[in-house]
């Protein structure tokens, strides 16, 4: 699986360096946390255990998605 | 309404170069990946070139990698495919088309120009 | 590269008939596949994504089914204008790739 990759990058254009997933049953993971009033950091990679979800927090709100085909 | 529209094509000789383009309308152009498809003369259809929506990452299949270049203008809502050291197995229909996710993995090429045909012959 | 093989590569029938495409891969592909319709001197058209979902303005006559290697498109009564070459394509793992074509003539 090919994933993007990065770690805490303020945009997606920034996340483009392409990681070979190689474990079973790896998923490309995105993690986008925004802070009230500033920019949204973006990390992204392969992960074996990604569960999307979506958290807010009094200080703003971090959102994980997850995907499974190249590129995704 | 969406609508791609390629141009460029024509005959061209072996080992020489071509530059094809595909204006899109109707749609915001710099949020979406797009590929070049092509099909060759009573064939079926082959993937050739992606680009994704800002245009820093691009992929290729082996057949083509190293003499195709696929690049946009997000400005000009144009895509572009560049193409060096022709052979006569590059004749073909090209069609540039949109690529539209549903969900965070699936996607399909939803929307396709008319296509441009290049012949590459002696 | 996942090879995908479409059968039959032709085949002819009767309006009102149900017509079914198949589609196999050689890897697992999930739900990734996508049908396209191509009718004769014209552009290739999405037909159904996600292995079952219609496109917009897609006959409901149309529909997929399967999962993992093995996939169907089927028409479930066939009309004049549904002659057209059908492609299966997966959107799983690079290089993407395309079946080679099933031609659809009605008798």
């Known amino acids: 699986l090919l994933c993007y990759s990065c770690k805490a990058q303020v945009s997606n254009e920034d996340c483009l360096q392409v990681e070979n997933c190689t474990q079973l049953g790896e998923q490309c993971w995105t993690a986008r946390i925004r802070a009230v009033g500033l920019l949204t950091v973006i990390s992204k990679g392969c992960s074996l255990n990604c569960v999307d979800d979506s958290q807010d927090y009094y200080v703003g709100k971090k959102n994980i998605t997850c995907c499974d085909t190249d590129l995704c | 309404q969406v609508q791609l529209v390629e141009s460029g094509g024509g005959l061209v000789k072996p080992g020489g170069s071509l530059r094809l383009s595909c204006a899109a309308s109707?749609?915001?152009?710099?949020?979406?990946?797009m590929s070049w498809i092509r099909q060759a003369p009573g064939k079926g259809l082959e993937w050739v070139s992606y680009?994704?929506?800002?245009?820093?990452?691009?992929f290729y299949p082996d057949t083509v990698k190293g003499r195709f270049t696929i690049s946009r203008d997000n400005a000009k809502n144009s895509l572009y495919l560049q193409m060096n050291s022709l052979r006569a197995e590059d004749t073909a229909v090209y069609y540039c088309a949109r690529r539209m996710y549903y969900g965070n993995s699936h996607w399909h090429f939803d929307v396709w120009g008319q296509g441009t045909t290049v012949t590459v012959s002696s | 590269d996942i090879q995908m093989t479409q059968s039959p590569s032709s085949l002819s029938a009767s309006v009102g008939d149900r017509v079914t495409i198949t589609c196999g891969t050689s890897q697992d592909i999930n739900n990734y596949l996508n049908w396209y319709q191509q009718k004769p001197g014209k552009v290739p058209k999405l037909l159904i994504y996600?292995?079952?979902r219609l496109h917009s303005g897609v006959p409901s006559r149309f529909s997929g089914s399967g999962s993992g290697t093995d996939f169907t498109l089927t028409i479930s009564s066939l009309q004049p204008e549904d002659v057209a070459t059908y492609y299966c394509?997966?959107?799983?793992?690079?290089?993407?790739?395309f079946g080679g074509g099933t031609q659809l003539t009605v008798l």
């Open positions: 996600y292995t079952s």
């Open positions: 680009i994704n929506d800002s245009g820093g990452s691009t």
């Open positions: 394509q997966q959107s799983k793992t690079l290089p993407w790739t």
């Open positions: 109707g749609f915001t152009f710099s949020s979406y990946s």
